[in-house]
């Protein structure tokens, strides 16, 4: 059986302040069952950016319909980007449990924010 892979295709993404940023992530398998979450930064201090199953993240939306059967695309779009959004974002697959167990992280995508053109 193929090992689960979390694919973040881009090393970096650069957007102008005020624009939207798309951070791509796909997974190679729907098994094991469990959520995908997006974080900014790594380690204990990382910040939860988006949980596709629950929570309120007003500036973040899923690019694909997460309820679609066999959906393997967990890309997100962050709107109205500000310089404070800069950082490296990780797409992380969890195994369902109590609590959920982290299985695999993508390689990370660095978001840089350019000044809005005048």
């Amino acid at each position: 059986e193929e090992e689960l892979q979390v694919i973040q295709p881009e090393k970096s993404v650069s957007v102008a302040a005020g624009d939207s940023a798309t951070l791509n992530c796909t997974v190679s398998s729907l098994i094991p069952v469990g959520p995908i979450q997006w974080f900014r930064g790594a380690g204990p201090g990382r910040e939860l950016i988006y949980n596709l199953k629950e929570g309120h993240f007003p500036r973040v939306t899923a690019v694909s319909d997460p309820t679609k059967r066999n959906n393997m695309d967990f890309s997100i779009r962050i709107s109205n980007i500000t310089p404070a959004d800069a950082g490296t974002y990780y797409c992380v697959k969890f195994r369902k449990g109590s609590p959920d167990v982290e299985l695999k992280s993508g390689a990370g995508t660095e978001l840089s924010v350019r000044a809005k053109p005048s």
């Epitope: 892979q5 694919i7 295709p9 881009e10 090393k11 791509n24 393997m72 993508g106």
Partner: antibody, heavy 119, light 103 residues
Amino acid sequence: DVQLVESEGGVVRPGESLRLSCEASGFTFRNSYMTWVRQAPGEGLEWVSTISDTGDTAYYADSVKGRFTISRDNSKNSLYLQMNSLRAEDTAIYYCAKSWIWWTFFDYWGLGTLVTVSS
Amino acid sequence: ALTQPASVSANLGGTVEITCSGGNSNHYGWYQQKSPGSAPVTLIYADTNRPSNIPSRFSGSTSGSTSTLTITGVQAEDEAVYYCGGSSTGDGIFGAGTTLTVL
């Protein structure tokens, strides 16, 4: 076994149109992103266009944007490439390819079909 | 753009590495074309995955911005052009190709 079979290409004049098709079998077509890649004589591989599994999203290379349209019919397991305003530089072998998970990865390819644009 | 050497050579039975670097990709694939106009064959997708019909002498690895295709125990039929492909659309998807000559 996965099979991708392109329709026969042909010779067309500059400015004319041609539609390519690719019939797929051996995998769940409706779950797969599909791609057209071409190779001009003596040149390397060039990505042309990709379409999402449901057909609602399409991506195009700058060189064909506005002239080529990719589409699919999941009920017929078929992929299409409508090529309009053809130019001499579109002369190439066109390959149909199945994308794996992320659309720039390809795990299976068709045998290809030759399109020649010449006056 | 993805950069790969124009040509490499290897002794029959030996080992050869073909590298691909540059661009904005986190992941890479490798494709073999035995003659111009023949259908490409996928050797490696997403860094290390090998389709079931591909011999185990082909392997892939990625470190940082460089992907490496390794052929161990090179055979005469491995003489071909090898293309790398990137995961970032900004990379143009394919490198220019590397011609492998078997000595």
